[in-house]
């Protein structure tokens, strides 16, 4: 599998992974004990036909062209978890692996 | 996990799974021996903020609001394989499980 990586200086218009640091402190999310910030990344860009299509299904839907199908969009195709320490609703401290918090790759689906 | 199911008579504007039968014969894709057609489904509809968001990451990116982030789009969040019989490039008949051919659920990511 393959995905493009870009940064804020890139001129790439196609679907690409961009760096993004999420800052829980800046959001005022005080129930998150740690990390206070982490590298989350995000996906942005255009999905020309066939470019970075994750699934054969995407191509088949384009071919069948049903009513209301908007064409593929740039979205995470591989994600990974991070470990977090946080308060749950009962004010207990929880340490756990939270899935799908980091975008590792972007593609068109 | 939860996703909406719609059909061609639905008035739902939000992200939804719609039925779609892919017909390889109609495409002229005769290198696919079987199946000749299968129920693939597809995703279509609007992604209002927080509706059917698959990942906490989606919410975080919205919150951080980086340059060029287009907001979530309606995309497959659960897919399943089908068994296929087909000719490869060397004209050998291959029988195999092809991943991500059927959309089981749609969501916003």
């Amino acid at each position: 599998d393959f995905g493009l990586d870009c940064d804020e200086h890139s001129t790439e218009s196609r679907c690409c992974r961009y760096p993004l640091t999420v800052d829980f402190e800046a959001f005022g999310w005080d129930w998150i004990i740690a990390p206070k910030r982490y590298k989350a990344n995000y996906c942005s860009g255009e999905c020309e036909f066939v470019f970075l299509q994750k699934y054969p299904h995407t191509h088949l839907v384009h071919q069948a062209n049903p009513r209301g199908s908007a064409g593929p969009c740039c979205t995470p195709t591989k994600m990974s978890p991070i470990n977090m320490l946080y308060f749950n609703g009962k004010e207990q401290i929880i340490y756990g692996k939270i899935p799908a918090m980091v975008v590792d790759r972007c593609g068109c689906s | 996990d939860f996703g909406l199911d719609c059909d061609e008579h639905s008035t739902e504007s939000r992200c939804c799974r719609y039925p779609l039968t892919v017909d390889f014969e109609a495409f002229g894709w005769d290198w696919i021996i079987a199946p000749k057609r299968y129920k693939a489904n597809y995703c279509s509809g609007e992604c209002e903020f927080v509706f059917l968001q698959k990942y906490p990451h989606t919410h975080l990116v919205h919150q951080a609001n980086p340059r060029g982030s287009a907001g979530p789009c309606c995309t497959p969040t659960k897919m399943s394989p089908i068994n296929m019989l087909y000719f490869n490039g060397k004209e050998q008949i291959i029988y195999g499980k092809i991943p991500a051919m059927v959309v089981d659920r749609c969501g916003c990511s």
């Epitope: - | 390889f24 014969e25 005769d30 290198w31 696919i32 021996i33 079987a34 199946p35 000749k36 068994n83 019989l85 000719f87 004209e91 008949i93 029988y95």
Partner: antibody
């Protein structure tokens, strides 16, 4: 509806060749295997081979391999079976049959449509 | 090649009878067995595939069973139109091979 129409009866001399045709209609000809089966008078059925019209990939019974050629003409949706160096024991009715895939496994097939058969008589 | 031995080679029965035809393969054929009916001067007609599945449009009086090397075709209540020759076919391996046939005659 799906139909296979075969060419008419032939009388051939030993050592000659015969080419039997099978014209398909009512379906996408290129996407289904065509098989050839023969039956000598008063005898059982014998599988000769198959061909996939899309790419002409074929598979022959070793018993006939040196003498048989299966071909297709996609423009007319017609399959052909040529048998060379005919002998008297090649006298038989030759059938074409479409092989239909019904299942989920690599050998999930059955014959759903047959041609009417072509009698080939080999006699000096 | 896989040998298919069909028995009996001929069988006399009366209308209303229940009859069974067997087919034995020279090795395990993984239930890739079909049954055909053939009437004089006609092409064979598929009845059963994958050992026990009925082809669309075939009456339920026909049934198939078996696994491994041994398979049977049963006709539950014979009607005049059922008197014909029946063949089995293995499709587990190339070349496909047929049984020698069972001729079902009116007693």
């Amino acid at each position: 509806q799906v139909q296979l129409v075969q060419s008419g009866a032939e009388v051939k001399k030993p050592g000659a060749s015969v080419k039997v045709s099978c014209k398909a209609s009512g379906y996408s000809f290129t996407g289904y295997f065509m098989h050839w089966v023969r039956q000598a008078p008063g005898q059982g059925l014998e599988w000769m081979g198959n061909i996939y019209p899309y790419n002409s990939v074929s598979n022959y019974n070793q018993r006939f391999k040196a003498r048989v050629t299966m071909t297709v003409d996609k423009s007319t949706s017609t399959a052909y079976m040529e048998l060379r160096s005919l002998r008297s024991d090649d006298t038989a009715v030759y059938y074409c049959a479409r092989r239909y895939y019904y299942g989920t496994g690599p050998a999930d097939w059955y014959y759903d449509v047959w041609g009417q058969g072509t009698l080939v008589t080999v006699s000096s | 090649d896989i040998q298919m031995t069909q028995s009996p080679s001929s069988l006399s029965a009366s209308v209303g009878d229940r009859v069974t035809i067997t087919c034995k393969a020279s090795q395990d054929i993984n239930s890739y067995l079909s049954w055909f009916q053939q009437k004089p001067g006609k092409a064979p007609k598929s009845l059963i595939y994958r050992a026990n599945r009925l082809v669309d449009g075939v009456p339920s009086k026909f049934s198939g069973s078996g696994s491994g090397q041994d398979y049977t075709l049963t006709i539950s209540s014979l009607q005049p139109e059922d008197f014909a020759t029946y063949y089995c076919l293995q499709s587990d391996e190339f070349p496909l091979t047929f049984g020698q046939g069972t001729k079902l005659e009116i007693k």
